[in-house]
C-alpha cells in the first residue's frame, strides 16, 4: 500500500461479529417465595434467576403452568394473568404473585432463550397466615391525684390472631405522659423514662403510672400516652391510652376529695386558725374556667358541729342557724376553731362543700361531704425532737435493718411504741418491711420497731439514692416531717469500652470520651473516678496540659482528659485504669491507635493479572507531608495476598525488570515509580476477589500509623474502563491485542480507554504495545 518511506491515507474497515446462540440457559437461583396469605408480592430476582452466556435477560423467557395457589400478573396490569415473563421483567420487579387458595403451592415452568429450552422446573410459593394484632380494654386509666396506678388488662389488653405469648407483645412508648410518669415496679422511676414494656408486664401489674401533683389545684386533668404495639411479623398498631386524673374518683389512698383536708392540732383550751394549709377546696373552684373563677366560691355547710369547741368566722360563731362559711373566708384566714377546754379528746366537724355561682346563684359543679379532724393536745406536752439521720447504704438486691442512726427522736413523755412514723412518699429503689409483718411494704411503724431491729429496707429497685418522706408523731403533738435517705450501691460495675482511642496522626493527641470510658452498673454512673494502674508506654495522659494519673468521668465528658504521644516509635499504645463508682471498682484496658493522615483510593475493582500504577490517586500522604514538613515514608507490613508491590523501571532503557518493594516514600508515589501487580487467586474458579495492603506510615515529629488499602479484583475485562493507570495488562489480553484481526468484544476502544485519565503510559496505543510486548 506504500513505499517504505511513504504512508497511505488512513483506511477504515468494519468488522461485524455475528452472534451464535450455542449456549443453553442455566437456572442459577430458584429459592421460591414466602408471602402473606391473600397478599400480592413481587417475585424478586434473588428468588428466581437464570443466566445464559450468549443471551440477554430480555431473551430469557419463563413459560409457566397455572399456579396451584394463586396467579402470576405483571405490575402494570394486575388484573390480567400471565403465562410467561422474562428475566428482565423479574429484574425490574415487574412480575407479581397474587396468592389465593392453599398455603403451600407454586407453579411449574420451563426456561428458554429462544433456541434452547430447560424444562421441568417448579417454583414454590408458601403463604403465611397474616398475624393481626388487636387492642382491647378501655384504653382509659383513671388515677387518683398524686397516686400510683398500675395499668391493667382492663385498661390495655393486646392479643394477636396467632395467640402470641404476652411476653412477645411489645409496647413502645412513642410519647410519654405529661402529668406524671410511667415506670416499672421492679425498676427505678427516677431515672430514664420507661420506653418499652410487654403485655405480660401489664398482666403482672408491673407497669405503673404515677401522677405528680402540680403546684396549682385542679379538679380533673387529662393525660395521654401514645403507644405502639408490635410483635413481628405482624404490622404495628398505634394506641392511645387516655389517663383521667380526677378528685371525683373514690380513692382509697386519698379519702378526701378536696385539695387539702389535713386536720388541725390545737393546744387544749386554746384557739387555732384553720387555714388553706389544712383545709382547701380550691380544686372545686378549678372546675370553673379561669376567666369566671373569681366570680365563684365554694360554700361549706357544717352538718355536724364540733362537740368540744366552736367554729368562728370573722369572730362570729357558727351554729345550726348560721352553718355556712366560704372558701374565700378560709383563704382570708377568717375561720377559727376555739377549744373549750376540759380534756384532750379528739374533736372535729362534718361538712358539705359545693361550688357556688356568681352572687350566690346555683351552678352545676362538684361537691363532697367530709369530716375535718381536730386533735387537741395537752398543753404540758413536750413535742418529740427528731435527731440527725445518717443515710442508709446497702447494695442493690440486699436487705438492711434501719437503726436509730437513721431514725430516732428524743421524747421525754412518750414510749418508743407511741412514736409513730407514717410514710408520706416512698422512693422507687426499694421498700420498708417489718420482720413478721408480711412480705409487702409497710407504711406505718413505730420507734419501737426501729429500736428492736424489726424494720428493714429491701433494695429491690435500681441503684439510686432515694428519700422516704415520713411524718412522725407521738399522738399528742402535730406530726413533724422527717426524711430517711437510702443510697443503693451497685452490686457490680462495668467499664464500657465502646471503641479504642483514635489519635489523629498529624496531631499526636486526642481527648478521651464516653466512647472510651464509661461506667455502668444497672444504670450509668456519671460520678465515676479513674486511677491509672498501668500507664501508657509511648505517651502520657494529661488534664489541663499536665500529666495525671487520676481523673473523673466528668472530666472525660468535658473533653479535659487527653492522651498525647511523646515517643513516636509505635502506632499504638494502651493503658490500664481502675474505675471506682459508689464504693465498687473495676479495671479496664484502653487501647490507643493512630489514625493515619492518608487519603486511600476507594473505587471500582482492579483487573487481575494487570500491573497498575501506585500513585497519589491510590495512596496520598500529601497532607501529612505539608503538616510535618517531611517526606512521609511507607513500610509494607502485610499483603497483598495475590500480587506484589514493585518498583517499575523509569524507561525502557533502564536495566532490569521490576523489583519487589517493601518500603517507599510519598515522593515515589508522586514520581509514578511504583506498581501493584494484581494477582489471580489460585485454586479457584476465575471471578471477583478481595485483597488488601497493610502499610505503616511514618513522618517526622508524629507517631506512625497503620493503614490499609482494601481493593476488589476481577478477571480482566478489556471492555471495561478502569479508573487507575494500568502499566500492563494480562498476558492473554496482550496476545489478543497483537492479532491484526482482533478487536474488543463490544467494538469499543481497547484497554487504554478509561476515566478519569488514560490508563496507559503516555504515547498512545502503539507505544503501549511497544513498551509491554518488546521491552
Amino acid at each position: 500500500a506504500s513505499e517504505m518511506d511513504r504512508q497511505s491515507h488512513p483506511v477504515a474497515f468494519t468488522v461485524t461479529v455475528l452472534p451464535v446462540n450455542d449456549q443453553p440457559p442455566i437456572l442459577t437461583t430458584n429459592t421460591g417465595l414466602q408471602m402473606w396469605e391473600g397478599a400480592t408480592a413481587p417475585i424478586p430476582a434473588e428468588a428466581l434467576r437464570s443466566t445464559d452466556g450468549d443471551s440477554g435477560s430480555e431473551d430469557l423467557v419463563y413459560t409457566i403452568e397455572q399456579p396451584s395457589n394463586g396467579r402470576v400478573v405483571l405490575r402494570g396490569a394486575p388484573g390480567t394473568e400471565v403465562r410467561s415473563f422474562t428475566q428482565a421483567q423479574l429484574d425490574g420487579g415487574l412480575v407479581l404473585f397474587s396468592h389465593r387458595g392453599t398455603l403451600d403451592g407454586g407453579f411449574r415452568f420451563r426456561l428458554s432463550d429462544g433456541e434452547h429450552t430447560s424444562p421441568g422446573h417448579f417454583f414454590r410459593v408458601t403463604a403465611q397466615k397474616q398475624v393481626l394484632l388487636s387492642l382491647k380494654g378501655s384504653q382509659t386509666l383513671t388515677v387518683c391525684p398524686g397516686s400510683v396506678q398500675p395499668l391493667s388488662s382492663q385498661t390495655l389488653r393486646a392479643s394477636s390472631s396467632a395467640g402470641t405469648d404476652p411476653q412477645l407483645l411489645l409496647y413502645r412508648v412513642v410519647r410519654g405522659p405529661q402529668l406524671g410518669r410511667l415506670f416499672h415496679a421492679q425498676q427505678d422511676s427516677t431515672g430514664e423514662a420507661l420506653v418499652n414494656f410487654t403485655q405480660a408486664e401489664v398482666y403482672a401489674g408491673n407497669i405503673l403510672y404515677e401522677h405528680e401533683m402540680p403546684p396549682e389545684p385542679f379538679w380533673e386533668a387529662h393525660d395521654t400516652l401514645e403507644l405502639q404495639l408490635s410483635s413481628p411479623p405482624a404490622r404495628d398498631v398505634a394506641a392511645t391510652l387516655a389517663v383521667a386524673v380526677s378528685f371525683e374518683a373514690a380513692c382509697p389512698q386519698r379519702p378526701s376529695h378536696l385539695w387539702k383536708n389535713k386536720g388541725l392540732w390545737v393546744p387544749e383550751g386554746q384557739r387555732a386558725r384553720i387555714t388553706v394549709a389544712a383545709l382547701d377546696a380550691s380544686n372545686l373552684l378549678a372546675s370553673v374556667p379561669s376567666p369566671q373563677r373569681s366570680e365563684h366560691d365554694v360554700l361549706f355547710q357544717v352538718t355536724q358541729f364540733p362537740s368540744r369547741g366552736q367554729l368562728l368566722v370573722s369572730e362570729e360563731p357558727l351554729h345550726a342557724g348560721q352553718p355556712h362559711f366560704l372558701q374565700s373566708q378560709l383563704a382570708a384566714g377568717q375561720l377559727v376553731y376555739a377549744h373549750g377546754g376540759g380534756g384532750t379528746q379528739q374533736d372535729g366537724f362534718h361538712f358539705r362543700a359545693h361550688l357556688q355561682g356568681p352572687a350566690g346563684a346555683s351552678v352545676a359543679g362538684p361537691q363532697t361531704s367530709e369530716a375535718f379532724a381536730i386533735t387537741v393536745r395537752d398543753v404540758n406536752e413536750r413535742p418529740p425532737q427528731p435527731q440527725a439521720s445518717v443515710p442508709l447504704r446497702l447494695t442493690r438486691g440486699s436487705r438492711a435493718p434501719i437503726s436509730r442512726a437513721q431514725l430516732s427522736v428524743v421524747d421525754p413523755d412518750s414510749a418508743p411504741g407511741e412514736i409513730e412514723y407514717e410514710v408520706q412518699r416512698a422512693p422507687h429503689n426499694g421498700f420498708l418491711s417489718l420482720v413478721g409483718g408480711g412480705l409487702g411494704p409497710v407504711t406505718r411503724f413505730t420507734q419501737a420497731d426501729v429500736d428492736s431491729g424489726r424494720l428493714a429496707f429491701v433494695a429491690n429497685g435500681s441503684s439510686v439514692a432515694g428519700i422516704f418522706q415520713l411524718s412522725m408523731s407521738d399522738g399528742a403533738s402535730p406530726p413533724l416531717p422527717m426524711s430517711l435517705a437510702v443510697d443503693i450501691l451497685p452490686s457490680a460495675i462495668e467499664v464500657q469500652l465502646r471503641a479504642p482511642l483514635e489519635v489523629p496522626q498529624a496531631l499526636g493527641r486526642s481527648s478521651l470520651s464516653q466512647q472510651q470510658l464509661r461506667v455502668v452498673s444497672d444504670r450509668e454512673e456519671p460520678e465515676a473516678a479513674y486511677r491509672l494502674i498501668q500507664g501508657p508506654q509511648y505517651g502520657h495522659l494529661l488534664v489541663g496540659g499536665r500529666p495525671t494519673s487520676a481523673f473523673s468521668q466528668f472530666q472525660i465528658d468535658q473533653g479535659e482528659v487527653v492522651f498525647a504521644f511523646t515517643n513516636f516509635s509505635s502506632s499504638h499504645d494502651h493503658f490500664r485504669v481502675l474505675a471506682l463508682a459508689r464504693g465498687v471498682n473495676a479495671s479496664a484496658v484502653v487501647n490507643v491507635t493512630v489514625r493515619a493522615l492518608l487519603h486511600v483510593w476507594a473505587g471500582g475493582p482492579w483487573p487481575q493479572g494487570a500491573t497498575l500504577r501506585l500513585d497519589p490517586t491510590v495512596l496520598d500522604a500529601g497532607e501529612l507531608a505539608n503538616r510535618t514538613g517531611s517526606v512521609p515514608r511507607f513500610r509494607l507490613l502485610e499483603g497483598p495476598r495475590h500480587g506484589r508491590v514493585v518498583r517499575v523501571p523509569r524507561a525502557r532503557t533502564e536495566p532490569g525488570g521490576s523489583q519487589l518493594v517493601e518500603q517507599f516514600t510519598q515522593q515515589d508515589l508522586e514520581d509514578g515509580r511504583l506498581g501493584l501487580e494484581v494477582g489471580r487467586p489460585e485454586g479457584r474458579a476465575p471471578g471477583p476477589a478481595g485483597d488488601s495492603l497493610t502499610l505503616e506510615l511514618w513522618a517526622q515529629g508524629v507517631p506512625p500509623a497503620v493503614a490499609s488499602l482494601d481493593f476488589a479484583t476481577e478477571p480482566y475485562n478489556a471492555a471495561r474502563p478502569y479508573s487507575v493507570a494500568l502499566l500492563s495488562v494480562p498476558e492473554a489480553a496482550r496476545t489478543e491485542a497483537g492479532k491484526p484481526e482482533s478487536s474488543t468484544p463490544t467494538g469499543e476502544p481497547g484497554p487504554m480507554a478509561s476515566s478519569p485519565e488514560p490508563a496507559v503510559a503516555k504515547g498512545g496505543f502503539l507505544s503501549f504495545l511497544e513498551a509491554n510486548m518488546f521491552s
Epitope: Q329, A359, G360
Partner: antibody, heavy 117, light 113 residues
C-alpha cells in the same frame, strides 16, 4: 352584725342620674359577701337591680343593664348605685342588701327616691 | 328570666289558725350541685325592709320562730304559718336565687280575719 345605711338625694329630675351610696358598718365590705341593690316602687313588689363583689365583679338586671352601674369603694367600706336617664317609673324605695350564700341576709332601712321635675 | 308567681294575692286568717302561701317558678330551681332548692321567703311589714325567713326552700333563718316553715321542690313551693300571730301581719315574698336576674314573686298580703 353587719348594718347597712343608704344615703342620697330624695328627689331627682327626669333624664338625670340617680346616685345612692350604701355604707357598711360592723363588718368589712371585703369579706366574702356580695352586695346588692333592690328597689320597691310605692305599693308594689320588689325588684333586684344588681350585685357587686368587693373585687369589682358585677351582675345587673338585664331589664336595666344599659342604665345601671354599681361600684365599690373598699377604703370607705361602701358601695354605690348609679341609675341614668331616670323617669317617673324609677320612683321607688331603694334598698341596699348583703347577699350571703344564696339569699339577701341583711337589708338597709331603704331610701325613697322620687323622680319629678 | 325566671318568673315567680304567688297565690293567693292576699288572705285573711284568724289568730292561731294556719296560713298557707304558694309560690310557683317558671322553671325548676333545684340545683344539681348540692340538691338544694334556691328559693327564699321574706316577710315585709309596712314601712320596714324585707326580712329573711326561709332559705333553700325549707331552712329557717336563725332567730325565726318555728311556726314558719317552708316546703316544696323544683317549681312548687309553700310557706306555712302554723299558728298565725298578730305580729305576722305582713306581705310575704318568695324569691329565686337560682339564676341571674334574681326575681321576686308579686307578694301575698296576710291579714287577721
Amino acid at each position: 352584725e353587719v348594718q347597712l345605711q343608704e344615703s342620697g338625694p330624695g328627689l331627682v329630675k327626669p333624664s338625670e342620674t340617680l346616685s345612692l351610696t350604701c355604707v357598711v358598718s360592723g363588718g368589712s365590705i371585703s369579706s366574702s359577701n356580695w352586695w346588692s341593690w333592690v328597689r320597691q316602687p310605692p305599693g308594689k313588689g320588689l325588684e333586684w337591680l344588681g350585685t357587686i363583689y368587693y373585687n369589682g365583679n358585677t351582675y345587673y338586671n338585664p331589664s336595666l343593664k344599659s342604665r345601671v352601674t354599681i361600684s365599690v369603694d373598699t377604703s370607705k367600706n361602701q358601695f354605690s348605685l348609679r341609675l341614668s336617664s331616670v323617669t317617673a317609673a324609677d320612683t321607688a324605695v331603694y334598698y341596699c342588701a348583703k347577699s350571703w350564700v344564696s339569699w339577701f341576709a341583711s337589708w338597709g332601712q331603704g331610701t325613697l327616691v322620687t323622680v319629678s321635675s | 328570666e325566671l318568673v315567680m308567681t304567688q297565690s293567693p294575692d292576699s288572705l285573711a286568717v284568724s289568730l292561731g289558725e294556719r296560713a298557707t302561701i304558694n309560690c310557683k317558678s317558671s322553671q325548676s330551681v333545684l340545683s344539681s350541685s348540692n340538691n338544694k332548692n334556691y328559693l327564699n321567703w321574706y316577710q315585709q311589714k309596712p314601712g320596714q325592709p324585707p326580712k329573711l325567713l326561709i332559705y333553700w326552700a325549707s331552712t329557717r333563718e336563725s332567730g325565726v320562730p318555728d311556726r314558719f316553715s317552708g316546703s316544696g321542690s323544683g317549681t312548687d313551693f309553700t310557706l306555712t304559718i302554723s299558728s298565725l300571730q298578730a305580729e305576722d301581719v305582713a306581705v310575704y315574698y318568695c324569691q329565686q336565687h337560682y339564676s341571674v336576674p334574681f326575681t321576686f314573686g308579686p307578694g301575698t298580703k296576710v291579714d287577721i280575719k
